[in-house]
């Protein structure tokens, strides 16, 4: 069996996790894709998917989660606003490509957040909270339910997964940004 | 080195199609990189209009996104805009340059010398 | 859309002095920002991306800190060159937004 990789990134309330998960775009384009939460002793859970089929750059939100698919370069782009203690835990991406079972992008990311300003170099350590205004944005597509032997993501709540945003507000500090593909200038 | 040139009519009616196309020398648009188009009226700061990708995947400014389509020739190598319905609030220079490897880098460096569009009747 | 606020909208500064510009995103933008400098009838000039690391060509004197919603330009020592307006960009996501601009002028 494969063995599974984990990448650690630690963060602080109220930053924002920011990483792009990279697929081979000639398969997997159009696909729809999903981020999960891998929790102790339980199978994923399907946090948000992008609509299916996956539209390029057009960006999906279901709560804190904002996924947007980029097709020219084959990168999934997840993010996590405003992160809590509780959203702690072991995440990955992952492909739907049914009949099959979804198809997991390496690594998987070991999330830590803990309580405490950031204090991020340059950045303003007195300043008040910032608001984090989300464009309204839906999403057509169910996160569907997959139950196999090996892997089983289940469809988030229902009032998460039909989403009509309209201007929520989520408090914000700072962002630390994961790039987790080669970046060429 | 890379290089951008802007060209087009320097005037335009109100409610026609301002047409403009930048020419990039010194470099392959189909090797990647976004393009894009700025503008900046009289004595005014910048608006970024749009973007486009070599493979024709377009990003618009949502306040001109109605009247703005940018295309791209990889054969002559070059890209191009066109506002639709233009008012005098569309007079200024419009600049084009090329953008960042990935949406989230999308810095502009360099530029076109920009070329003066005015709306008049 | 993201706002981008820059600070003060115009500067004196005398020749060989430090100038320090700020630019505020309405969200954060990580460390996705840009700042440039234009001077009058040329087009801007890449100065910083990356909130931090200098365009090619650009030289030491100019340097970029910040992350999140608070960013700085310093200028360490004006060169008589360096008087122009400077303007912040966010790169972070569509669609990109420019801050109004900080005009550096000889004091």
């Known amino acids: 069996a494969t063995k599974l990789t984990e990448e650690k990134y630690e963060l602080k309330e109220g930053q924002t996790l920011d990483v792009k998960c990279d697929y081979t775009l000639e398969k997997f384009a159009s696909s729809q894709k999903a981020w999960q939460i891998i929790r102790d002793g339980e199978m994923p859970k399907t946090l948000a998917c992008t609509e299916r089929p996956s539209k390029n750059s057009h960006p999906v939100q279901v709560g804190r989660i904002i996924l947007e698919d980029y097709h020219d370069h084959g990168l999934l782009r997840v993010r996590m606003v405003n992160l809590q203690v509780e959203d702690s835990g072991l995440y990955q991406c992952v492909i739907y490509q049914p009949p099959k079972e979804p198809h997991m992008l390496f690594d998987r990311i070991r999330l830590v957040v803990t309580k405490g300003f950031s204090g991020t170099p340059g950045s303003n350590e007195n300043s008040t909270q910032n608001v984090y205004k989300i464009p309204p944005t839906t999403t057509k597509a169910l996160c569907p339910l997959y139950t196999s032997p090996r892997t089983v993501t289940q469809a988030p709540p229902k009032s998460t997964a039909d989403v009509s945003t309209p201007d929520s507000e989520i408090n914000l500090t700072n962002v630390t940004d994961i790039i987790r593909v080669p970046v060429f200038n | 080195q890379v290089q951008l040139q802007e060209s087009g009519p320097g005037l335009v009616k109100p409610s026609e199609t301002l047409s403009l196309t930048c020419a990039v020398s010194g470099y392959s648009i189909s090797s990647g990189y976004y393009w894009a188009w700025i503008r900046q009226p009289p004595g005014k700061g910048l608006e970024w209009i749009g973007s486009?990708?070599?493979?024709?995947?377009?990003y618009y400014n949502p306040s001109l996104k109605s009247r703005v389509t940018i295309s791209v020739d990889t054969s002559k190598n070059q890209f191009s805009l066109k506002l639709s319905s233009v008012t005098a609030a569309d007079t200024a220079v419009y600049y084009c340059?090329?953008?960042?490897?990935?949406?989230?880098?999308?810095?502009?460096?360099?530029w076109g010398q920009g070329t003066l569009v005015t709306v008049s009747s | 859309e993201i706002v981008m606020t820059q600070s003060p909208a115009t500067l004196s500064v005398s020749p060989g002095e430090r100038a320090t510009l700020s630019c505020r995103a309405s969200q954060s933008v990580g460390s996705n920002l840009a700042w440039y400098q234009q001077k009058p009838g040329q087009a801007p000039r890449l100065l910083i991306y990356?909130?931090?690391t200098r365009a090619t060509g650009i030289p030491a004197r100019f340097s970029g800190s910040g992350s999140g919603t608070e960013f700085t330009l310093t200028i360490s020592s004006l060169q008589s060159e360096d008087f122009a307006v400077y303007y912040c960009?966010?790169?972070?996501?569509?669609?990109?937004?420019f801050g109004g601009g900080t005009k550096v002028e000889i004091k």
């Open positions: 340059a090329r953008g960042g490897p990935y949406p989230w880098s999308g810095w502009f460096d360099p």
């Open positions: 990356g909130a931090s």
């Open positions: 960009q966010q790169h972070d996501v569509w669609p990109y937004t």
């Open positions: 486009i990708y070599h493979s024709g995947s377009t």
